[in-house]
Interface confidence: low
């Protein structure tokens, strides 16, 4: 089943690599469990960036190695990618999976343009 | 191949409890979620609960109080445990797959025969 | 619990035949919940179709689900000998997951 997910279209990453983004998805159902996945479309490529399952009202917990942290409020993920540079300026989808209980409902958001700007090296000074 | 591999059959005395594994391969486990149905003696299949890779477990009311549903990621490994055993709990116990996305299942193991005599 | 109730629980029929076997819901569940088992003695279930119409990668084409609502169809077009088993509808809809009671199909 299809499921409203918003998420904002422009989002510029700080300068150290950091962008954040809230992810929102419009609940038909009182979901207990709930998967929340970021991809990365970039020349067409779709990958997979991150992906956290959570009980609503607790932590997402991304594993030990992700990029990606985040933290939940109601039907809202708020979102933070580190590590960025500027190769990995993209379009970042959010897509949500209400787990459980059944029924299962997918949305998945048109994506959030995120630009990743490298800084300028510092000059050397004398 | 996929596959999930059961624990053989046991012999349980009533008011004891019994630990059935499942040993999945061929697949990521994390990726999906591992069901426990079980089937008494020619009779039909009753769901007993399921578990996902984020170790969250969701049971039948009916034998909420007595089930327990464990895994091991390290093995690729899932557990169900039955306490309180009477007579009624004889039958095939089966792990099955289900994927992210729906409840159907798509893979089955063997089954495992448990027994309540005294 | 949404109860799903097989007809007939059981029939007879020879190779050849084209076999129907119905499943009611006790309250309607959308065609995509909605999946069929077939089981052989000692053996473990096996998946022929799911969200009611889809059939699973592998089984022969000669198996069909149809319905909506609260009622479902599997259907056989045309029997072999090796689909003399027992048939299960399952709905995943509503929690807890519950299946029919079983269809047995026997050699005439």
């Known amino acids: 089943k299809a499921m409203h997910v918003a998420q904002p279209a422009v989002v510029l990453a700080s300068s150290r690599g950091i962008a954040s983004f809230v992810c929102e998805y419009a609940s038909p159902g009182k979901a207990t469990e709930v998967r929340v996945t970021v991809l990365r479309q970039a020349d067409s490529q779709v990958t997979e960036v991150c992906a956290a399952t959570y009980m609503m009202g607790n932590e997402l917990t991304f594993l030990d190695d992700s990029i990606c942290t985040g933290t939940s409020s109601g039907n809202q993920v708020n979102l933070t990618i580190q590590g960025l540079r500027a190769m990995d300026t993209g379009l970042y989808i959010c897509k949500v999976e209400l787990m459980y209980p059944p029924p299962y409902y997918l949305g998945i958001g048109n994506g959030t343009q995120i630009y990743v700007i490298d800084p300028e090296p510092c000059p050397d000074s004398d | 191949q996929v596959q999930l591999v059961q624990s053989g059959a046991e012999v349980k005395k009533p008011g004891s409890s019994v630990k059935v594994s499942c040993k999945a391969s061929?697949?990521?486990?994390?990726?999906?979620?591992i069901h426990w149905v079980r089937q008494a003696p020619g009779q039909g299949l009753e769901w007993i609960g399921q578990?996902?890779?984020?170790?969250?477990?969701y049971y039948n009311p009916s034998l909420k109080s007595r089930v327990t549903i464990t895994a091991d990621k390290s093995t690729s490994t899932a557990y169900m445990e039955l306490s309180s055993l009477r007579s009624e709990d004889t039958a095939v116990y089966y792990c099955?797959?289900?994927?992210?996305?729906?409840?159907?299942?798509?893979?089955w193991g063997q089954g495992t025969l448990v027994t309540v005599s005294s | 619990d949404i109860q799903l109730t097989q007809s007939p629980s059981s029939l007879s029929a020879s190779v050849g035949d084209r076999v129907t076997i119905t499943c009611r819901a006790s309250?309607?569940?959308?065609?995509?919940?909605l999946a069929w088992y077939q089981q052989k003695p000692g053996k473990a279930p096996k998946l022929l179709i799911y969200?009611?119409?889809t059939l699973q990668s592998g089984v022969p084409s000669r198996f069909s689900g149809s319905g909506s609502g609260t009622d479902f169809t599997l259907t056989i077009s045309s029997l072999q000998p090796e689909d003399f088993a027992t048939y299960y509808c399952?709905?995943?809809?509503?929690?807890?997951?519950?299946f029919g009671q079983g269809t047995k199909v026997e050699i005439k």
């Open positions: 399952q709905q995943y809809y509503r929690s807890p997951i519950t």
């Open positions: 061929g697949f990521t486990f994390s990726g999906y979620a």
């Open positions: 578990i996902y890779h984020s170790g969250s477990t």
């Open positions: 099955a797959r289900s994927g992210y996305g729906g409840y159907d299942f798509d893979y």
């Open positions: 969200a009611a119409s």
């Open positions: 309250q309607s569940v959308p065609r995509r919940y």
